[in-house]
């Protein structure tokens, strides 16, 4: 039975040209995390494998940095980066947990972080 929950940074906003940290945290389970994948829509951005470490997609290597922790840092943001991001936790023996973050990249300096929320 899957008992875990993923807490994410929720709906967030950031300024064009700036950076943002995408964070997810898996709790309430003793399952072993074997890999975390970060995806934007259906594009794979990065992988953090428990055995072999971080792998950044060649398409994003200039704008994506690993961490902190199992999170992901997006740099040199553009308006096109607006959209849904998913952290996909592959665990044993539970299976897969998915968290969702919505990022809005703003032209102006009025960007502010949204509230955290949980995905069961």
């Amino acid at each position: 039975m899957m008992t875990g929950t993923i807490e994410t940074t929720g709906n967030i906003s950031a300024e064009k040209g700036g950076s943002i940290i995408l964070q997810c945290h898996l709790s309430s389970t003793t399952a072993q995390v074997t890999q975390v994948n970060w995806e934007q829509q259906d594009q794979l951005l990065a992988i953090c494998n428990a055995d072999l470490g971080w792998h950044i997609s060649p398409s994003f290597k200039d704008r994506v940095a690993p961490g902190p922790g199992l999170g992901l840092t997006l740099q040199s943001l553009t308006v096109n980066d607006t959209g849904e991001y998913f952290c996909i936790y592959h665990t044993y023996p539970d299976g897969t947990y998915t968290g969702r973050i919505f990022l809005e990249v703003l032209e102006s300096s009025v960007a502010e972080h949204g509230a955290r929320f949980q995905i069961p």
Epitope: T34, Q35, D42, L44, I47, H55, I56
Partner: antibody, heavy 121, light 108 residues
Framework: QVQLVQSGAEVKKPGASVKVSCKAS????????MHWVRQAPGQGLEWMGI????????SYARKFQGRVTMTRDTSTSTVYMELSSLRSEDTAVYYC??????????????WGQGTMVTVSS | EIVMTQSPATLSVSPGERATLSCRAS??????LAWYQQKPGQAPRLLIY???TRATGIPARFSGSGSGTEFTLTISSLQSEDFAVYYC??????????FGGGTKVEIK
């Protein structure tokens, strides 16, 4: 040209160990992951594990953890797969296969010729 | 682990006809899917990677499509040398990387 050459066929008794080698040539050995895949007679392909030849990090399928060890010798561009506590079900052809660059992931574009391992009393 | 399911298990096709092979992943693998061909007594050979990109030296009659969980390998006009077993594989989540059970393409 890029190629992987494996060691010859082996016959082992149950409980013994086997060590298969895979020598790479024609490319920069350290830059690509190496995988091991096996195929029992008349069966499909089964992934066993992966090694990063640059730094020696490994990841094994849970089924083989505790029984398999993958190592490499960068001076000879050779990877090794050792499987211990052999049983009859381990009778199979064992393949090494080159994966993607160690900075990302990739399909298996180059395969060794295979090594037949027979476990029989 | 991600389970890869191939269908059909066996496909009987006449030379010159089109063959369509299916592969389904139990969860999304984006486009990180490969197809391999294996003939008796030989090692597998990479045909398609990235779901739709032909590997070096692979004839244009082989094409791959799909993303997410549903994938297809199409052989537009089967040649005698194409009769073999075909495997799909996801290479995005490990351990373990996983293969489908294979589809045997045989002469009708």
């Amino acid at each position: 040209q890029v190629q992987l050459v494996q060691s010859g066929a082996e016959v082992k008794k149950p409980g013994a160990s086997v060590k298969v080698s895979c020598k790479a040539s024609g490319y920069t050995f350290r830059e690509y992951y190496m995988h091991w895949v096996r195929q029992a007679p008349g069966q499909g392909l089964e992934w066993m594990g992966i090694i990063n030849p640059s730094i020696g990090l490994t990841s094994y399928a849970r089924k083989f953890q505790g029984r398999v060890t993958m190592t490499r010798d960068t001076s000879t561009s050779t990877v090794y797969m050792e499987l211990s506590s052999l049983r009859s079900e381990d009778t199979a052809v064992y393949y090494c296969a080159r994966g993607g660059r160690t900075t990302w992931i990739g399909a298996f574009d180059i395969w060794g010729q295979g090594t037949m391992v027979t476990v029989s009393s | 682990e991600i389970v890869m399911t191939q269908s059909p298990a066996t496909l009987s096709v006449s030379p010159g006809e089109r063959a369509t092979l299916s592969c389904r992943a139990s969860q999304s693998v984006s486009s990180n899917l490969a197809w391999y061909q294996q003939k008796p007594g030989q090692a597998p050979r990479l045909l398609i990677y990235g779901a739709s990109t032909r590997a070096t030296g692979i004839p244009a009659r082989f094409s791959g499509s799909g993303s997410g969980t549903e994938f297809t390998l199409t052989i537009s006009s089967l040649q005698s040398e194409d009769f073999a077993v075909y495997y799909c594989q996801q290479y995005v989540v490990w351990p373990p990387l996983t293969f489908g059970g294979g589809t045997k393409v045989e002469i009708k």
